[in-house]
């Protein structure tokens, strides 16, 4: 991988109502099951195609999820985190966290494998061979005229 | 990603005892919700007993309840499923499921469309 990664870290609100199939979302996470080391948060793992979050669009695989119907989800057992979203009624209030991965520029969601950012070198490769090419062009021009 | 494979299964006479095992590839296993399911001749795939990742919670098919126990050793990366009492109407080919955390909804760790996951399956006979 190349260049520096850097995350941008953005807060969003997101209400869903309860499908037939329910929210349609899994998690990992918590103090017994830590997902991302050093932290006991709760994740989004997977988001179920057709369910209540995959239809309303915001939620991301990858989000950590901060707090339920208010309530907060840190230094919670991944099954009580289980258990408070199973029981947090038919409109549910999510407070969640989006991690853009940034690198050198480029930004793109943060996935789980390696981060597909473009290194930097790529892009300025082909823009100052362009600038070298339409200066030679320029100053042919210009002894011509 | 997760790799399972099942074994145990044999011919068994009816009112006997098996275990089953289901072995998983990956340093991960203990975040992934494990089920076992079993499939008859010409019959839809069943739930048959599901665990959390940490093995605290499970659940049974009404089939089963009382007769079979589900278990999993996270630090062997195996599940296990003790079968007691067996019928001949549990004849089948069981299959080891698995998918990633846990499903935040009720009843959906039930569903054979959930899980991501699954091995070739092992035959199990009662006559």
């Known amino acids: 991988m190349n260049g520096r990664v850097d995350y941008l870290v953005t807060e969003e609100e997101i209400n869903l109502t309860r499908g037939p199939s329910g929210l349609g979302f899994n998690i990992v996470g918590g103090t017994d099951q830590q997902y991302v080391s050093n932290d006991s948060g709760i994740y989004v793992s997977r988001i179920k195609e057709n369910g209540a979050a995959a239809l309303d669009g915001r939620l991301q695989e990858g989000d950590k999820i901060l707090s339920v119907n208010g309530q907060d989800l840190k230094n919670l057992l991944h099954q009580d985190a289980v258990d408070l979203f199973r029981n947090a009624g038919y409109a549910v209030s999510l407070r969640v966290q989006h991690r853009l991965q940034v690198q050198n520029g480029p930004i793109g969601h943060r996935g789980e494998g390696d981060p597909s950012g473009i290194p930097i070198f790529m892009v300025l490769v082909p823009v100052f061979a362009l600038t070298m090419v339409a200066a030679w062009a320029f100053m042919r021009y210009r002894q011509q005229l | 990603h997760v790799q399972l494979v099942e074994s145990g299964g044999r011919l068994v006479q009816a009112g006997d005892s098996l275990k089953l095992s289901c072995a998983a590839s990956?340093?991960?296993?203990?975040?992934?919700?494990m089920g076992w399911f079993r499939q008859a001749p010409g019959k839809e795939r069943e739930f048959v007993a599901g665990?959390?990742?940490?093995?605290?919670?499970?659940n049974y098919g009404d089939s089963v309840k009382g007769r079979f126990s589900i278990s999993r050793d996270n630090a062997r990366n195996t599940m296990y499923l003790q079968m007691n009492s067996l019928k001949p109407e549990d004849t089948a080919v069981y299959f080891c499921?698995?998918?990633?955390?846990?499903?935040?909804?009720?009843?959906?760790?039930?569903?054979?469309?959930?899980?991501?996951?699954w091995g070739q399956g092992t035959q199990v006979t009662v006559s």
């Open positions: 990956g340093r991960t296993f203990s975040t992934y919700t």
């Open positions: 665990t959390s990742p940490s093995g605290d919670n499970r």
């Open positions: 499921a698995a998918f990633r955390g846990s499903c935040v909804d009720y009843g959906c760790d039930f569903r054979v469309s959930q899980y991501d996951y």
